[in-house]
């Protein structure tokens, strides 16, 4: 019963995971525009991994997609494929774990096969989780590299009488959504792999089991006890990697000038 | 057809005050962003207020900081500017605008008169 | 806060004639994230309310005339009128919509000869 809820707990938790990995790959608040020193700025400017918008007080919002692709920073690139990486992983590791759950029978299947499932499962969400933290932790590096770059370049070249401020950017929305994805994601697999210990079947072999009825000496011999616990030769482990590109048109939307009522 | 209607400007004593509305038809009024200027009876154009969409963020001149407040009725489709502790140098003609692509007004009323005198 | 200044104060013009009227800011209006310089250019005719000319530095309103063009980047800015009309005669006014408080300039009276 143990195991059931481990497991069961360990999928849901994957599944809000990854769910949290997309939706954090596919947002625009990557970096914002940091008001430390321009509080009440009427121009607000924002940045995804796959477009960059501005939003005006007036309400209009226009994003527009980068349509480069070897234009792009490295990083950029980078964190992109880290992302994708982990919702390849992480999906091809929910499709595993739904015919590795305990309370779905398919067929005729043996535990042993969803033990090694569960685990398969298990590994997946744990390089998802990792493949997310690791794209969100590179670009919270790049911004604040880029943060101190800009804040020296702030106080320089400031000889003239017009000053020229420059936009920098901090943290936005989608990094802490990733972070934490990532890390549900990572916590999911782990209770995958736990559950994967229990579901394994345990082999009790009698052998060399004799009785002889005309002496008094019995010899029992008794087999040796095996346990399968999923981490053993019998079980094959899958590492299944996988990658995706997407492209992003231009967006620009904002109501119409005539919006009547 | 886009029209803003401004009403409630008359003769008011200092730091007496006063509700300015701004009564929108055409558009919704909670999709844009709305300001509130000023023309001052030398001619000069100063901008007094905004409310951004959504109605979230409000903004102010240092003029009429903590003495004016912008407010927005999506029901009525009306916008207010509330003035409080009026001086003198509050006279003149108040304009209501609807925000569009970059933060510019395509659309203003005919204005209301406010004078401030004893 | 942005200070906006323009140029000249006044203008006395003949129709037909080309005009240039210049409006400059203490900062930049350019923003970076999508290139765009935030001044926007109006016309106020005596006794109406001003009317949108031109928005991000150089982008004409729908049913202004093109004889209307608006230019210049980062803090030094253009309204030139091409040719001048009888009904072109108005007060210009340049805006910073850039950062609060949006600030105008003082105006550019275009008189007829």
């Known amino acids: 019963m143990a195991v059931t809820a481990c497991q069961g707990l360990g999928f849901v938790v994957s599944l809000i995971g990854i769910a949290g990995i997309i939706a954090a790959t596919c947002m625009d608040q990557w970096s914002t525009q940091d008001l430390y020193n321009n509080p009440v700025t009427a121009v607000f400017n924002y940045q995804g991994l796959w477009r960059s918008c501005v939003r005006e007080s007036s309400g209009f919002t226009e994003c527009r997609g980068y349509f480069t692709l070897l234009g792009l920073p490295a990083m950029l690139q980078a964190v992109r494929a880290l992302m994708i990486v982990g919702i390849v992983l992480g999906a091809i590791g929910l499709l595993v774990s739904i015919f590795a759950l305990k309370c779905i029978r398919i067929g005729s299947m043996e535990d042993s096969a969803k033990a090694n499932m569960t685990l398969t499962s298990g590994i997946m969400f744990i390089v998802s989780g990792l493949c997310a933290i690791a794209g969100v932790s590179v670009f919270a590096n790049m911004l604040v590299t880029n943060f101190w770059m800009s804040t020296a370049n702030m106080y320089t070249g400031m000889g003239g009488m017009v000053q020229t401020v420059q936009t920098r950017y901090t943290f936005g929305a989608a990094l802490f959504v990733g972070w934490v994805a990532g890390g549900l994601t990572l916590i999911g697999g782990v209770m995958m792999c736990i559950a994967c210990r229990g579901l394994a079947p345990e082999e009790t072999n009698y052998k060399a089991v004799s009785y002889h009825a005309s002496g008094h000496s019995v010899a029992y011999k008794p087999g040796g006890f095996k346990a399968s616990t999923g981490f053993g030769s019998n079980t094959k482990n899958k590492k299944i990697y996988d990658g995706g590109a997407r492209t992003e048109d231009e967006v620009q939307s904002y109501p119409s000038k005539h919006d009547y009522v | 057809e886009v029209q803003l209607v401004e009403s409630g400007g008359d003769l008011v004593q200092p730091g007496g005050s006063l509700k300015l509305s701004c009564a929108a038809s055409g558009f919704t009024l909670s999709r844009y962003g709305m300001s509130w200027v000023r023309q001052t009876p030398d001619k000069r154009l100063e901008w007094v207020s905004t409310?951004?969409?959504?109605?979230?963020?409000?903004y102010y001149s240092d003029s009429v900081k903590g003495r004016f407040s912008i407010s927005r009725d999506n029901a009525r489709n009306t916008l207010y500017l509330q003035m409080s502790s009026l001086k003198s140098e509050d006279t003149a003609m108040y304009y209501c605008g609807r925000l569009y692509y970059g933060n510019a007004m395509d659309y203003w009323g005919q204005g209301t008169a406010v004078t401030v005198s004893s | 806060d942005i200070v906006m200044t323009q140029s000249p104060s006044s203008l006395t013009v003949t129709a037909g004639e080309k005009v240039t009227m210049s409006c400059k800011s203490s900062q930049s209006l350019l923003n970076s994230g999508n290139q765009k310089n935030y001044l926007t250019w109006y016309q106020q005719k005596p006794g109406q309310p001003p009317k949108l000319l031109i928005y991000?530095?150089?982008t004409r309103e729908s049913g202004v005339p093109d004889r209307f063009t608006g230019s210049g980047s980062g803090t030094h800015f253009t309204l030139t009128i091409s040719s001048v009309q009888a009904e072109d005669l108005a007060v210009y006014y340049c805006?910073?919509?850039?950062?609060?408080?949006?600030?105008f300039g003082a105006g550019t009276k275009l008189e007829l000869k």
């Open positions: 409310i951004i969409s959504g109605g979230i963020n409000t």
């Open positions: 991000w530095a150089s």
């Open positions: 805006q910073n919509d850039y950062s609060y408080p949006l600030t």
